[in-house]
């Protein structure tokens, strides 16, 4: 289950309106749901950005967001929210979603540079994308929601636009 916009634990908290919010906004007076990409930190008494803790060992509250963020950083992969998995575009080029358009169209234009899995796929082999051993470098407390995403090359603005669209 996604930790986005949900409390990591129960409880209610008063918010002092006159203070500057760590997120620049307060979101009501009882325990609240937070905007996308934030989570409720009851000890701090406010919504906090998930981005700050994605590299920290404790990302239970933002597990889905952090997996998605790490996945987006890796060229040629995208995060599928339904599957809750980091998908290799190379494994689905040809019937790819728009998130892979940039990767697949570029790769198809230059077959010399195709990765082995795509070369196999084009010659009729099917890649088993479930084996992602050694690819994850995230939380030591990730539990059952561990992601195969590996922080890697940053996406360009155009690529990010595709990922976020």
């Amino acid at each position: 289950m996604s930790g986005l916009g949900r409390s990591r634990r129960g409880g209610r908290s008063r918010v002092d309106q006159e203070e500057r919010s760590p997120q620049g906004l307060w979101t009501g007076v009882a325990m609240r749901s937070c905007p996308e990409e934030q989570y409720w930190d009851p000890l701090l008494g406010t919504c906090m950005s998930c981005k700050a803790i994605c590299n920290h060992q404790s990302q239970r509250t933002c597990a889905t967001f952090c997996r998605s963020l790490n996945c987006r950083k890796e060229q040629g992969r995208f995060y599928d929210h339904l599957l809750r998995d980091c998908i290799s575009c190379a494994s689905i080029c040809g019937q790819h979603p728009k998130q892979c358009a940039y990767f697949c169209e570029n790769k198809l234009r230059s077959p010399v540079n195709l990765p082995p899995e795509l070369r196999r796929q084009r010659s009729g082999e099917v890649e088993n994308n479930s084996d992602n051993s050694g690819r994850y470098q995230g939380s030591e407390h990730r539990g059952s929601e561990a992601s195969p995403a590996l922080p890697g090359l940053k996406l360009s603005a155009d690529q990010l636009a595709l990922v976020y669209s």
Partner: antibody, heavy 118, light 107 residues
Framework: QVQLVQSGAEVKKPGASVKVSCKAS????????MHWVKQKPGQGLEWMGY????????KYAQKFQGKVTMTSDKSTSTVYMELSSLTSEDTAVYYC???????????WGQGTLVTVSS | DIQMTQSPSSLSASVGDRVTITCRAS??????LSWYQQKPGKAPKLLMR???RLHSGVPSRFSGSGSGTDFTLTISSLEQEDFATYYC?????????FGGGTKVEIK
Amino acid sequence: QVQLVQSGAEVKKPGASVKVSCKASGYTFTNYVMHWVKQKPGQGLEWMGYILPYNDGTKYAQKFQGKVTMTSDKSTSTVYMELSSLTSEDTAVYYCARYDWEGSFDYWGQGTLVTVSS
Amino acid sequence: DIQMTQSPSSLSASVGDRVTITCRASQDISNYLSWYQQKPGKAPKLLMRYTSRLHSGVPSRFSGSGSGTDFTLTISSLEQEDFATYYCQQGNLFPPTFGGGTKVEIK
């Protein structure tokens, strides 16, 4: 390794202000919340408030509203805690402490003794 | 605010003794209970987070247990460097609050 180094002891007169610094190293400064904790001589620990250096967001304990102001300087990875209108009640050791995102304060500065005396 | 009550406020023990300190929260704090050790003139040091997880570098003779409102810190065999004051702290609800401390002295 993570280190929080605070400024030295201060002696102030009643009514004055004091600004204590806490310089962080060994981690990404903007990724963690910094808290301040007060300890009067021979007494326990009292939470004062926190600052998120990422965007200078702050939140203070009700007791310290109007008394404390927390700021940060990203260029030097330093947070500051300023106390105004000092009285003898403000005589204490002040600690900065990093929040570990799981409800604990995992690293602490060495403390700064502020003495208010006429 | 959540009140944290530690007991005893002080205790005398000898090297090698098993020592138990308790902390009670005024309301349910799940497992978000931390323990700190403080020596005179020094800053507190995190010993235990989330009730029973030892902080890096903390000896295994320290252990924690409990859930909800009642928690304990146990030192299985007291060593000379363990004579100090111990504080519990709840991390479940704003604002964070500390127990009054337990001073462990040499008998």
